[in-house]
Amino acid sequence: SSPTSSASSFSSSAPFLASAVSAQPPLPDQCPALCECSEAARTVKCVNRNLTEVPTDLPAYVRNLFLTGNQLAVLPAGAFARRPPLAELAALNLSGSRLDEVRAGAFEHLPSLRQLDLSHNPLADLSPFAFSGSNASVSAPSPLVELILNHIVPPEDERQNRSFEGMVVAALLAGRALQGLRRLELASNHFLYLPRDVLAQLPSLRHLDLSNNSLVSLTYVSFRNLTHLESLHLEDNALKVLHNGTLAELQGLPHIRVFLDNNPWVCDCHMADMVTWLKETEVVQGKDRLTCAYPEKMRNRVLLELNSADLDCDPILPPSLQTS
């Protein structure tokens, strides 16, 4: 059936019908107010409607639910729990809906939920148990395969007195519920660092997007266990150099493609190993585009064109020879 707007179905001219429906389990073909539904496509779209809460009368057939561009503010526990449950719901998009709080168990009772997009919400308070649903040390496995969390960092003045990176990682790791996660996007979140334990506990990852953050170093991050990883996006960060340990780990991953564009590479003596690696590796995509940012004399030099003589470090003068 073609998408139907519920505005005509539930107008003020049918008050009895509206109240009768709200008191009973939803009819299989009804569509919530301010939404568009297509049973044939198993899709419900409640887009740019300034909704302040998740509609209660979602049709049981829904497989793809778009709740983007609203003003939801808070996603409470069991926000999508229904009787009967939304057993078919596989893809849920909540991007750009002004969510600042996602509570524990917000996505409980969605047994088929494989894709979740919370991007472009200023999540000042993401419960550690938002995705696991319980505070048990080992939770029931989440069905999530794709988790999209791009640009969920709140404005600085709205952040709690805790590390934003820590808050997000706590939610990713709680109860080991996301062991089956294959795609994780964390782009544009001002991440300064990646907690060292996060990747080790997401062994099924195929795609990891950390682009457009503020990562300075990967020294304490281990990719060794991510044997299924196919793409690693590190573009537009603050990376200065990749050290031997990281190079070896990336080189050994059997399916990997790495994206490193637009980082402020420091082309001094510490860059020698990375340049040697870049000249031979096939895992870095677009490696011929990587250029030096520092020191000033090296700015815009192509990394692949450097040789060891180019990569020097200014000698450290003993204190007696230093000038003020």
Epitope: Q251, I256, R257
Partner: antibody
Amino acid sequence: EVQLVESGGGLVQPGGSLRLSCAASGFTFTDYYMSWVRQAPGKGLEWVGFIRNKGNGYTTEYSASVKGRFTISRDNSKSSLYLQMNSLKTEDTAVYYCARYRGNPHYAMDYWGQGTLVTVSS
Amino acid sequence: EIVLTQSPGTLSLSPGERATLSCRASESVEFYGTSFLQWYQQKPGQAPRLLIYGASNVESGIPDRFSGSGSGTDFTLTISRLEPEDIAVYFCQQSRKVPSTFGGGTKVEIK
């Protein structure tokens, strides 16, 4: 399911030309390096060359024995790989296999086609 | 180019026996901690089939009687208990440097 199907083999005279095709399916073609490997009758395997993926600009590498005579190309809209063979010699007679490199190409080829026979003879 | 030498040329064993195939490289095939050496199985009239990658990683779907070992320049493919369906030619291949090269092959046959 990954599938590679070669075609275009046949009998050609020395000095002639032939174009082999490989139709790929079951994976995102532009993400992968693709290669040609050949095997002369009763002999071992010989790497002919590869073409890189989108991220690495679809550039090519060849073995010394075919460089300047053979050209590997790809039509990504058709998920097809090609081998244009010019100035053919009798020693180019072989079964030609199309193969997909693993995501990390350093680990070489994980899927192969069944091959197409090229015979260069007068 | 890197030359790979396989031995023996032919290996005749009874079913259930252990098969040990060797591949030696003319220079190291190691790069940043990984040896880029593969083993392929080819049965008559068929395309090669990947068994082992990175010297010791068993490709998915390959029986666990196949294993690979070695690093640097010396590598071994082991079939722990030979089965009749393992009759084939086995090739090693290095992908450390362009051009990629193959060994001459070891033919495994049943005695």
